[in-house]
Interface confidence: medium
Protein backbone atom coordinates (compact mmCIF):
# COMPACT_ATOMS: atom_id res chain seq x y z
CA UNK A 1 0.00 0.00 0.00
CA UNK A 2 2.90 2.31 0.79
CA UNK A 3 4.45 1.57 -2.56
CA UNK A 4 1.13 2.37 -4.26
CA UNK A 5 0.96 5.68 -2.44
CA UNK A 6 4.56 6.41 -3.41
CA UNK A 7 3.78 5.70 -7.06
CA UNK A 8 0.67 7.90 -6.90
CA UNK A 9 2.70 10.71 -5.31
CA UNK A 10 5.39 10.43 -8.00
CA UNK A 11 2.72 10.50 -10.67
CA UNK A 12 1.12 13.58 -9.06
CA UNK A 13 4.50 15.30 -8.88
CA UNK A 14 5.16 14.53 -12.53
CA UNK A 15 1.74 15.82 -13.52
CA UNK A 16 2.24 18.98 -11.47
CA UNK A 17 5.68 19.51 -13.04
CA UNK A 18 4.19 19.04 -16.52
CA UNK A 19 1.35 21.41 -15.65
CA UNK A 20 3.81 24.06 -14.43
CA UNK A 21 5.88 23.82 -17.61
CA UNK A 22 2.75 23.88 -19.74
CA UNK A 23 1.35 26.87 -17.81
CA UNK A 24 4.67 28.72 -18.10
CA UNK A 25 4.71 28.09 -21.85
CA UNK A 26 1.16 29.34 -22.14
CA UNK A 27 1.96 32.47 -20.10
CA UNK A 28 5.01 33.10 -22.32
CA UNK A 29 2.94 32.61 -25.46
CA UNK A 30 0.22 34.91 -24.13
CA UNK A 31 2.83 37.51 -23.17
CA UNK A 32 4.33 37.41 -26.67
CA UNK A 33 0.87 37.66 -28.17
CA UNK A 34 0.08 40.53 -25.79
CA UNK A 35 3.22 42.42 -26.88
CA UNK A 36 2.34 41.86 -30.49
CA UNK A 37 -1.22 43.05 -29.93
CA UNK A 38 0.12 46.08 -28.01
CA UNK A 39 2.47 46.94 -30.87
CA UNK A 40 -0.34 46.57 -33.38
CA UNK A 41 -2.61 48.76 -31.25
CA UNK A 42 0.08 51.45 -31.00
CA UNK A 43 0.51 51.31 -34.78
CA UNK A 44 -3.23 51.64 -35.35
CA UNK A 45 -3.34 54.46 -32.78
CA UNK A 46 -0.53 56.45 -34.45
CA UNK A 47 -2.14 55.92 -37.88
CA UNK A 48 -5.43 57.23 -36.53
CA UNK A 49 -3.66 60.23 -34.96
CA UNK A 50 -1.92 61.02 -38.27
CA UNK A 51 -5.21 60.74 -40.17
CA UNK A 52 -6.90 63.01 -37.64
CA UNK A 53 -4.04 65.54 -37.93
CA UNK A 54 -4.21 65.43 -41.74
CA UNK A 55 -7.96 65.90 -41.64
CA UNK A 56 -7.62 68.86 -39.26
CA UNK A 57 -5.01 70.44 -41.54
CA UNK A 58 -7.16 69.80 -44.62
CA UNK A 59 -10.12 71.34 -42.81
CA UNK A 60 -8.12 74.42 -41.82
CA UNK A 61 -6.75 74.78 -45.34
CA UNK A 62 -10.24 74.38 -46.76
CA UNK A 63 -11.56 77.03 -44.36
CA UNK A 64 -8.83 79.43 -45.48
CA UNK A 65 -9.66 78.79 -49.12
CA UNK A 66 -13.35 79.35 -48.44
CA UNK A 67 -12.59 82.58 -46.55
CA UNK A 68 -10.36 83.75 -49.41
CA UNK A 69 -13.03 82.85 -51.94
CA UNK A 70 -15.68 84.72 -49.98
CA UNK A 71 -13.33 87.72 -49.74
CA UNK A 72 -12.52 87.53 -53.46
CA UNK A 73 -16.20 87.29 -54.40
CA UNK A 74 -17.05 90.21 -52.11
CA UNK A 75 -14.16 92.21 -53.56
CA UNK A 76 -15.11 91.37 -57.14
CA UNK A 77 -18.75 92.23 -56.65
CA UNK A 78 -17.67 95.48 -55.01
CA UNK A 79 -15.28 96.22 -57.88
CA UNK A 80 -18.10 95.51 -60.35
CA UNK A 81 -20.45 97.83 -58.46
CA UNK A 82 -17.78 100.55 -58.43
CA UNK A 83 -17.20 99.99 -62.16
CA UNK A 84 -20.91 100.21 -62.96
CA UNK A 85 -21.18 103.36 -60.85
CA UNK A 86 -18.24 104.91 -62.73
CA UNK A 87 -16.17 104.77 -59.54
CA UNK A 88 -18.16 107.61 -58.00
CA UNK A 89 -18.63 105.58 -54.81
CA UNK A 90 -16.08 103.22 -53.36
CA UNK A 91 -16.99 100.81 -50.57
CA UNK A 92 -14.07 98.43 -51.05
CA UNK A 93 -10.39 98.73 -51.89
CA UNK A 94 -9.14 98.13 -55.44
CA UNK A 95 -7.22 94.89 -56.02
CA UNK A 96 -3.62 95.10 -54.67
CA UNK A 97 -4.55 97.93 -52.29
CA UNK A 98 -4.53 97.46 -48.51
CA UNK A 99 -7.53 98.46 -46.39
CA UNK A 100 -7.01 100.12 -43.00
CA UNK A 101 -9.42 102.16 -40.87
CA UNK A 102 -11.72 103.20 -43.71
CA UNK A 103 -8.97 104.01 -46.22
CA UNK A 104 -7.22 102.12 -49.01
CA UNK A 105 -3.43 102.29 -49.40
CA UNK A 106 -1.17 101.41 -52.30
CA UNK A 107 2.56 100.97 -51.73
CA UNK A 108 4.87 101.57 -54.69
CA UNK A 109 7.79 99.28 -55.42
CA UNK A 110 9.41 101.74 -57.83
CA UNK A 111 10.68 105.28 -57.20
CA UNK A 112 9.64 108.71 -58.55
CA UNK A 113 10.11 112.39 -57.70
CA UNK A 114 7.40 113.84 -55.42
CA UNK A 115 5.46 115.59 -58.21
CA UNK A 116 5.39 112.46 -60.38
CA UNK A 117 4.30 110.34 -57.41
CA UNK A 118 1.53 112.86 -56.66
CA UNK A 119 0.34 112.69 -60.30
CA UNK A 120 0.36 108.88 -60.19
CA UNK A 121 -1.93 108.85 -57.15
CA UNK A 122 -4.28 111.40 -58.74
CA UNK A 123 -4.62 109.19 -61.84
CA UNK A 124 -5.69 106.40 -59.46
CA UNK A 125 -8.40 108.67 -57.98
CA UNK A 126 -6.27 108.91 -54.84
CA UNK A 127 -3.67 111.22 -53.30
CA UNK A 128 -0.26 110.86 -51.68
CA UNK A 129 -0.76 109.48 -48.17
CA UNK A 130 -1.92 111.89 -45.45
CA UNK A 131 -0.79 110.73 -41.99
CA UNK A 132 -3.27 111.75 -39.31
CA UNK A 133 -2.41 109.57 -36.29
CA UNK A 134 0.26 107.49 -34.57
CA UNK A 135 -1.75 104.33 -35.38
CA UNK A 136 -1.80 105.16 -39.08
CA UNK A 137 1.93 105.95 -38.93
CA UNK A 138 2.62 102.52 -37.37
CA UNK A 139 0.44 100.76 -39.95
CA UNK A 140 2.32 102.47 -42.79
CA UNK A 141 5.71 101.64 -41.29
CA UNK A 142 4.77 97.95 -41.03
CA UNK A 143 3.95 97.87 -44.73
CA UNK A 144 6.76 100.07 -46.04
CA UNK A 145 9.84 98.79 -44.31
CA UNK A 146 12.82 101.10 -43.68
CA UNK A 147 12.75 103.01 -46.98
CA UNK A 148 12.61 106.69 -47.88
CA UNK A 149 8.99 107.16 -48.98
CA UNK A 150 7.13 110.31 -50.11
CA UNK A 151 4.04 111.48 -48.22
CA UNK A 152 1.43 114.04 -49.24
CA UNK A 153 2.96 116.95 -47.37
CA UNK A 154 4.68 119.90 -49.07
CA UNK A 155 5.55 123.57 -48.57
CA UNK A 156 6.27 124.29 -52.25
CA UNK A 157 3.62 127.03 -52.18
CA UNK A 158 4.50 128.59 -48.83
CA UNK A 159 3.43 126.98 -45.54
CA UNK A 160 3.39 123.21 -45.01
CA UNK A 161 0.15 121.71 -46.38
CA UNK A 162 -1.36 118.25 -46.68
CA UNK A 163 -2.49 117.46 -50.24
CA UNK A 164 -6.07 116.65 -49.16
CA UNK A 165 -6.52 119.88 -47.17
CA UNK A 166 -6.12 118.28 -43.71
CA UNK A 167 -4.94 120.99 -41.32
CA UNK A 168 -1.18 120.70 -40.82
CA UNK A 169 -0.71 122.95 -37.77
CA UNK A 170 -3.20 121.15 -35.51
CA UNK A 171 -2.68 117.66 -36.93
CA UNK A 172 -0.34 114.76 -36.21
CA UNK A 173 3.36 115.46 -36.86
CA UNK A 174 6.29 113.07 -36.69
CA UNK A 175 9.38 115.01 -37.83
CA UNK A 176 12.92 113.91 -37.07
CA UNK A 177 14.71 116.13 -34.54
CA UNK A 178 15.52 119.57 -36.03
CA UNK A 179 13.39 118.89 -39.12
CA UNK A 180 12.00 120.35 -41.31
CA UNK A 181 15.07 122.49 -41.98
CA UNK A 182 14.70 123.48 -45.67
CA UNK A 183 18.38 122.60 -46.09
CA UNK A 184 20.07 123.98 -49.17
CA UNK A 185 23.58 122.77 -48.38
CA UNK A 186 23.08 120.00 -50.95
CA UNK A 187 23.89 122.47 -53.71
CA UNK A 188 21.07 121.13 -55.90
CA UNK A 189 19.37 124.51 -56.06
CA UNK A 190 16.59 125.68 -53.73
CA UNK A 191 15.77 124.20 -50.35
CA UNK A 192 13.72 121.17 -49.36
CA UNK A 193 9.97 121.39 -49.95
CA UNK A 194 8.60 117.84 -49.84
CA UNK A 195 8.19 115.51 -46.86
CA UNK A 196 9.06 111.83 -46.74
CA UNK A 197 9.32 108.94 -44.30
CA UNK A 198 12.96 108.31 -43.43
CA UNK A 199 14.36 104.84 -42.72
CA UNK A 200 13.18 105.02 -39.08
CA UNK A 201 9.70 106.21 -40.08
CA UNK A 202 10.07 109.77 -38.83
CA UNK A 203 9.68 112.57 -41.37
CA UNK A 204 12.23 114.73 -43.13
CA UNK A 205 11.95 117.46 -45.74
CA UNK A 206 13.92 116.83 -48.90
CA UNK A 207 14.51 118.03 -52.46
CA UNK A 208 11.27 117.21 -54.30
CA UNK A 209 13.00 115.90 -57.37
CA UNK A 210 14.70 113.05 -55.52
CA UNK A 211 13.32 109.66 -56.60
CA UNK A 212 11.74 107.90 -53.60
CA UNK A 213 9.02 105.29 -53.14
CA UNK A 214 5.54 106.59 -52.41
CA UNK A 215 2.17 105.63 -50.90
CA UNK A 216 -1.23 106.50 -52.36
CA UNK A 217 -4.35 106.76 -50.19
CA UNK A 218 -8.04 106.98 -50.95
CA UNK A 219 -10.93 107.13 -48.48
CA UNK A 220 -13.64 104.46 -48.56
CA UNK A 221 -17.26 105.60 -48.76
CA UNK A 222 -19.48 104.30 -45.97
CA UNK A 223 -21.51 101.32 -47.22
CA UNK A 224 -25.26 101.99 -47.11
Amino acid sequence: QNSQLREDLLALRQNFSNLTVSTEDQVKALSTQGSSVGRKMKLVESKLEKQQKDLTEDHSSLLLHVKQLVSDVRSLSCQMAAFRGNGSERTCCPINWVEYEGSCYWFSSSVRPWTEADKYCQLENAHLVVVTSRDEQNFLQRHMGPLNTWIGLTDQNGPWKWVDGTDYETGFQNWRPEQPDNWYGHGLGGGEDCAHFTTDGRWNDDVCRRPYRWVCETKLDKAN
Epitope: R176, D181, N182, W183, Y184, G185, H186, G191
Partner: nanobody
Framework: EVQLLESGGGLVQPGGSLRLSCAAS????????MIWVRQAPGKGLEWVSG????????YYADSVKGRFTISRDNSKNTLYLQMNSLRAEDAAVYYC?????????WGQGTLVTVSS
Amino acid sequence: EVQLLESGGGLVQPGGSLRLSCAASGFTFETQPMIWVRQAPGKGLEWVSGIEGDGGRTYYADSVKGRFTISRDNSKNTLYLQMNSLRAEDAAVYYCAKSGSSFDYWGQGTLVTVSS
Protein backbone atom coordinates in the same frame (compact mmCIF):
# COMPACT_ATOMS: atom_id res chain seq x y z
CA GLU B 1 24.35 126.75 -26.59
CA VAL B 2 25.37 125.77 -30.13
CA GLN B 3 29.13 125.90 -30.71
CA LEU B 4 31.22 125.11 -33.80
CA LEU B 5 35.00 125.19 -33.62
CA GLU B 6 37.09 124.81 -36.78
CA SER B 7 40.76 123.81 -36.83
CA GLY B 8 43.41 122.41 -39.19
CA GLY B 9 44.05 125.45 -41.39
CA GLY B 10 47.51 126.68 -42.22
CA LEU B 11 50.06 127.42 -44.92
CA VAL B 12 50.46 124.82 -47.64
CA GLN B 13 52.19 124.69 -51.02
CA PRO B 14 50.17 124.27 -54.25
CA GLY B 15 49.42 120.56 -54.77
CA GLY B 16 49.61 119.95 -51.01
CA SER B 17 46.95 118.63 -48.61
CA LEU B 18 45.19 119.75 -45.42
CA ARG B 19 42.51 118.25 -43.23
CA LEU B 20 40.07 120.63 -41.55
CA SER B 21 38.04 119.62 -38.51
CA CYS B 22 34.93 121.13 -36.95
CA ALA B 23 34.02 120.17 -33.38
CA ALA B 24 30.28 120.61 -32.73
CA SER B 25 28.33 120.86 -29.47
CA GLY B 26 25.01 122.11 -28.12
CA PHE B 27 22.71 120.31 -30.62
CA THR B 28 21.85 116.82 -31.90
CA PHE B 29 24.77 116.51 -34.30
CA GLU B 30 23.86 113.17 -35.91
CA THR B 31 20.51 114.42 -37.20
CA GLN B 32 21.86 117.66 -38.61
CA PRO B 33 23.14 118.18 -42.17
CA MET B 34 26.38 120.18 -42.15
CA ILE B 35 28.29 122.24 -44.71
CA TRP B 36 31.63 123.85 -45.38
CA VAL B 37 31.70 127.35 -46.90
CA ARG B 38 34.65 129.62 -47.59
CA GLN B 39 35.39 133.29 -48.07
CA ALA B 40 38.42 134.36 -50.06
CA PRO B 41 39.87 137.84 -49.29
CA GLY B 42 37.65 140.54 -50.76
CA LYS B 43 35.11 138.03 -52.08
CA GLY B 44 31.68 136.77 -51.07
CA LEU B 45 30.81 133.49 -49.37
CA GLU B 46 31.16 130.37 -51.50
CA TRP B 47 29.48 127.05 -50.70
CA VAL B 48 32.09 124.26 -50.81
CA SER B 49 30.53 121.00 -49.66
CA GLY B 50 27.61 119.49 -47.73
CA ILE B 51 26.89 116.22 -45.93
CA GLU B 52 23.63 114.77 -44.60
CA GLY B 53 23.08 113.73 -40.99
CA ASP B 54 23.89 110.05 -41.39
CA GLY B 55 26.82 110.78 -43.71
CA GLY B 56 25.09 108.82 -46.44
CA ARG B 57 25.06 111.59 -49.03
CA THR B 58 27.71 114.17 -49.81
CA TYR B 59 27.72 117.17 -52.16
CA TYR B 60 30.48 119.28 -53.69
CA ALA B 61 30.87 122.52 -55.60
CA ASP B 62 32.22 121.88 -59.12
CA SER B 63 35.39 123.81 -58.25
CA VAL B 64 36.41 121.23 -55.58
CA LYS B 65 34.87 118.01 -56.93
CA GLY B 66 37.40 115.17 -57.02
CA ARG B 67 39.87 117.04 -54.77
CA PHE B 68 37.95 117.62 -51.53
CA THR B 69 36.21 115.00 -49.39
CA ILE B 70 33.67 115.85 -46.68
CA SER B 71 33.04 113.34 -43.89
CA ARG B 72 31.77 113.21 -40.33
CA ASP B 73 32.19 111.12 -37.18
CA ASN B 74 28.89 111.28 -35.32
CA SER B 75 30.34 109.48 -32.29
CA LYS B 76 32.82 112.37 -31.91
CA ASN B 77 30.44 115.16 -33.03
CA THR B 78 33.04 116.18 -35.58
CA LEU B 79 32.89 117.27 -39.23
CA TYR B 80 35.91 116.98 -41.54
CA LEU B 81 37.09 118.35 -44.87
CA GLN B 82 40.02 116.58 -46.50
CA MET B 83 41.57 118.91 -49.08
CA ASN B 84 44.00 117.47 -51.64
CA SER B 85 45.72 118.99 -54.70
CA LEU B 86 45.28 122.46 -53.24
CA ARG B 87 45.41 125.44 -55.61
CA ALA B 88 46.04 129.15 -55.09
CA GLU B 89 42.32 129.83 -55.62
CA ASP B 90 41.45 127.55 -52.63
CA ALA B 91 43.03 130.08 -50.25
CA ALA B 92 40.26 131.40 -47.95
CA VAL B 93 38.80 131.35 -44.47
CA TYR B 94 36.85 128.05 -44.18
CA TYR B 95 33.76 127.89 -42.02
CA CYS B 96 31.66 124.91 -41.00
CA ALA B 97 27.96 125.60 -40.54
CA LYS B 98 24.92 123.91 -39.10
CA SER B 99 22.62 124.78 -41.93
CA GLY B 100 18.91 125.27 -42.03
CA SER B 101 16.95 127.56 -44.29
CA SER B 102 19.61 130.12 -43.47
CA PHE B 103 23.08 129.21 -42.20
CA ASP B 104 22.05 129.91 -38.65
CA TYR B 105 25.19 128.83 -36.77
CA TRP B 106 28.79 129.40 -37.78
CA GLY B 107 32.20 128.72 -36.40
CA GLN B 108 34.89 131.38 -36.20
CA GLY B 109 36.64 129.93 -39.29
CA THR B 110 40.11 128.58 -40.00
CA LEU B 111 42.48 130.25 -42.47
CA VAL B 112 43.91 128.24 -45.37
CA THR B 113 46.82 129.84 -47.25
CA VAL B 114 48.11 128.25 -50.47
CA SER B 115 51.43 129.69 -51.52
CA SER B 116 54.82 128.56 -52.79
